[in-house]
Interface confidence: medium
């Protein structure tokens, strides 16, 4: 299993995963005590037929041609948790792990 | 966590899992000695905002609206694995459970 | 519907050698086991080995392992049995079986269909 | 090789009787176990496959049961169409082995 990383300059058109950092001070997203800002990434890029597909499932699919099924998209395929400070709405402050916030790697599903 | 199910009559536009027969025998895939066909499901249909997201990344990306993000698509979010008889490389019969073979549920990702 | 056809009686000298064809018909050839069981006159049944069609890959009963040849030709869905240096014992109806996948564990398989079976008769 | 036993090796019964034949193996097979039946001139057919489980097409007078290396097939009530020899199949393992029969003759 693997995936292609990007960044701003690269040229590559195929699926992929690119930084972002999602500032949750400026959504106003004041609830989150912490972290202000983290690293989430996100997938972007074309899937052409067999290019890092994810699933034996997605190729059948491609083989099946059913009415409607579009082809496979780029999405994340592995994601990992953040922890995270936050005011629940009873306004109690909880601390949790919060679960696929981060995208580890993108693939064609 | 939920999904919409849909049948080739649905005239639902939105992400939904559809049924699909995969059928190993007219594909020519012999060297699956068994199931000669299962079902595989599918996912097909329109992700508008928030509709069946499966993570919190996946708003928090359309907020940050970062270059060359397509917004979600509908993609597979539960799979499960179906027990297989094939023949490998060396001509070898191996009996195994094949991850992510079978939609579950679908959503927009 | 599946259909398998074999070919007709046989009368050989001992030592001389056997072919018998088993031609399927009504389903996909390729994917299917084709399993060979003989049955000496007033005797049980007795497996002899299986083919694979798709890849030619066989199992073949210890017992007749020096001796037999199972053998395929996926162009007209024939599956072939070759016994060779042949004894009186080997007096026998010989039968192919389509041997049928029906579950979800290694061993789940069934004989679903056999051929009529061809008499082989070894005399001098 | 797993050695196949069947028991009685004949049978004498009647219309209407039932009767059950046993199968004993020399290992534990882990219910892979088939029953056939055959008459004169003809090629087996397959009646239970997996221990109990009875083949499509087959009449639910016919069941199997066992399991570890003991097995049995019952006819509940006879008829005429019945009377045949039965074998029992072990394919835990290869080579697959045959029972020696069960002749089932009109009483």
């Known amino acids: 299993d693997f995936g292609l990383d990007c960044d701003e300059h690269s040229t590559e058109s195929r699926c992929c995963r690119y930084p972002l950092t999602v500032d949750f001070e400026a959504f106003g997203w004041d609830w989150i005590i912490a972290p202000k800002r983290y690293k989430a990434n996100y997938c972007s890029g074309e899937c052409e037929f067999v290019f890092l597909q994810k699933y034996p499932h997605t190729h059948l699919v491609h083989q099946a041609n059913p009415r409607g099924s579009a082809g496979p998209c780029c999405t994340p395929t592995k994601m990992s948790p953040i922890n995270m400070l936050y005011f629940n709405g009873k306004e109690q402050i909880i601390y949790g792990k919060i679960p696929a916030m981060v995208v580890d790697r993108c693939g064609c599903s | 966590d939920f999904g919409l199910d849909c049948d080739e009559h649905s005239t639902e536009s939105r992400c939904c899992r559809y049924p699909l027969t995969v059928d190993f025998e007219a594909f020519g895939w012999d060297w699956i000695i068994a199931p000669k066909r299962y079902k595989a499901n599918y996912c097909s249909g329109e992700c508008e905002f928030v509709f069946l997201q499966k993570y919190p990344h996946t708003h928090l990306v359309h907020q940050a609206n970062p270059r060359g993000s397509a917004g979600p698509c509908c993609t597979p979010t539960k799979m499960s694995p179906i027990n297989m008889l094939y023949f490998n490389g060396k001509e070898q019969i191996i009996y195994g459970k094949i991850p992510a073979m079978v939609v579950d549920r679908c959503g927009c990702s | 519907q599946v259909q398998l056809v074999q070919s007709g009686a046989e009368v050989k000298k001992p030592g001389a050698s056997v072919k018998v064809s088993c031609k399927a018909s009504?389903?996909?050839?390729?994917?299917?086991?084709m399993h060979w069981v003989r049955q000496a006159p007033g005797q049980g049944l007795e497996w002899m080995g299986n083919?694979?069609?798709?890849?030619?890959?066989?199992n073949y009963n210890q017992r007749f392992k020096a001796r037999v040849t199972m053998t395929t030709d996926t162009s007209t869905s024939t599956a072939y049995m070759e016994l060779r240096s042949l004894r009186s014992d080997d007096t026998a109806v010989y039968y192919c079986?389509?041997?049928?996948?029906?579950?979800?564990?290694?061993?789940?398989?069934?004989?679903?269909?056999w051929g009529q079976g061809t008499l082989v008769t070894v005399s001098s | 090789d797993i050695q196949m036993t069947q028991s009685p090796s004949s049978l004498s019964a009647s219309v209407g009787d039932r009767v059950t034949i046993t199968c004993k193996a020399s290992?534990?097979?882990?219910?892979?176990l088939s029953w056939f039946q055959q008459k004169p001139g003809k090629a087996p057919k397959s009646l239970i496959y997996?221990?109990?489980r009875l083949v499509d097409g087959v009449p639910s007078k016919f069941s199997g049961s066992g399991s570890g290396t003991d097995y049995t097939l019952t006819i509940s009530s006879l008829q005429p169409e019945d009377f045949a020899t039965y074998y029992c199949?072990?394919?835990?393992?290869?080579?697959?082995?045959f029972g020696q029969g069960t002749k089932l003759e009109i009483k």
């Open positions: 079986a389509r041997r049928y996948y029906y579950g979800t564990g290694p061993a789940d398989w069934y004989f679903d269909s």
């Open positions: 009504g389903y996909s050839f390729t994917g299917y086991f």
């Open positions: 083919i694979y069609p798709y890849n030619g890959v066989s």
């Open positions: 290992q534990d097979i882990n219910s892979y």
């Open positions: 997996r221990a109990n």
């Open positions: 199949l072990q394919s835990d393992e290869f080579p697959l082995t």
